[in-house]
């Protein structure tokens, strides 16, 4: 699987999940988020050669087409597959509020 366990341990040029740390205050200007200060959102990147974690028959065909026709611009894209939520804490006045934000952390990628 093209997940953090594999991708973070290997120098993989093809489609894989890559580490990306986002600081809420410095990177996004979200000064009001109290905790966490930031988090690993991660992102997917890298080429999608034939049979590289193909998501659908279409992406398999597209990957094969691109392999056999290297000059063609059409090829599958490396996109998030599994995402996890992130819990944040902020204050409304002096009242703490905890929210779970869905689909915030990329855990694995696929070619689609």
């Amino acid at each position: 699987a093209l997940d953090t366990n594999y991708c973070f341990r290997n120098l993989e040029e093809n489609c894989c999940v890559r580490p990306l740390y986002i600081d809420f205050r410095q990177d996004l200007g979200w000064k009001w988020v109290h905790e966490p200060k930031g988090y690993y959102a991660n992102f997917c990147s890298g080429p999608c050669p034939y049979l590289r974690s193909a998501d659908t028959t279409h992406s398999t065909v597209l990957g094969l087409y691109n392999t056999l026709n290297p000059e063609a611009s059409a090829s599958p894209c490396c996109v998030p597959q599994d995402l996890e939520p992130l819990t944040i804490l902020y204050y409304v006045g002096r009242t703490p509020k905890v929210e779970q934000l869905s689909n915030m952390v990329v855990k694995s990628c696929k070619c689609s």
Epitope: L28, G29, W30, K31, W32, Y90, Y91, V92, G93, R94, T95, K97, E99, L101
Partner: antibody, heavy 121, light 111 residues
């Protein structure tokens, strides 16, 4: 230039609902809380609630809880305020106002032009 | 809810004089070393505009004739050398406690 442009005046019957829009430009919509404030004729300002457009988190004033719904469309950078079960006491000018940015609950540095909502049978 | 009480309800000032508006909160609006109190002016037929942020910080583009002071529960907005353009209703606002609340307003007129 930051701009908040609200929809036009509305006339509604008692018991009906009204939905006011606030189209923004000149800043990154998902970076600031959007507040809604109402002002009855000749009266002061009442904070209704707020929404964080990035994921739709909301905080409401209990005075309006259950009747007001705040939403946001990030694709058009537009915020919406819907008020249901309208009554004569809801006749007011409704403002959208951008939060200052340092806190969730904050001062408001940019305001829409206001939308007059009239309730009449 | 924190109740904000402004005095006086209305004020008539001669041009070039100084006007003072008070705002008293029903409980302290101080937290983490800040006073969560702000001031707005609503000119006739217009939307409110932010003048003072966090009790004493002048908002960008606002004349330095406006100044704010105070902490805890008692705050003051001063307008020096009052001009015709300063007429309107002034509001204080706190955001230390949910819900955010405003004062009832002080109407400033020129003599």
């Amino acid at each position: 230039e930051v701009q908040l442009v609200q929809s036009g005046a509305e006339v509604k019957k008692p018991g009906a609902s009204v939905k006011v829009s606030c189209k923004t430009s000149g800043y990154i919509f998902i970076t600031y809380w959007m507040n809604w404030v109402r002002q009855a004729p000749g009266a002061g300002l009442d904070w209704m609630g707020q929404i964080f457009p990035a994921w739709g988190s909301t905080n409401y004033n209990e005075m309006f809880e259950g009747r007001v719904t705040l939403t946001a469309d990030t694709s058009t950078s537009t915020a919406y305020m819907e008020l249901s079960s309208l009554r004569a006491g809801d006749i007011a000018v409704y403002y959208c106002a951008r939060g200052y940015g340092n806190y969730a609950l904050d001062a408001m540095d940019y305001w829409g032009q206001g939308t007059l909502v009239t309730v009449s049978s | 809810d924190i109740v904000m009480t402004q005095t006086p309800p209305s004020l008539s000032v001669s041009p070039r004089e100084t006007a003072s508006i008070s705002c008293r909160a029903s409980e302290s609006v101080d937290s983490y070393g800040n006073s969560f109190m702000h001031w707005y002016l609503q000119k006739p037929g217009q939307s409110p505009q932010l003048l003072i942020y966090l009790a004493s910080n002048l908002e960008s583009g606002v004349s330095d004739r406006f100044s704010g002071s105070g902490s805890g529960t008692d705050f003051t907005l001063r307008i020096s050398r009052v001009e015709a353009n300063d007429t309107g209703v002034y509001y204080c606002q706190q955001n230390n406690e949910d819900p955010l609340t405003f004062g009832q307003g002080t109407k400033l007129e020129l003599k």
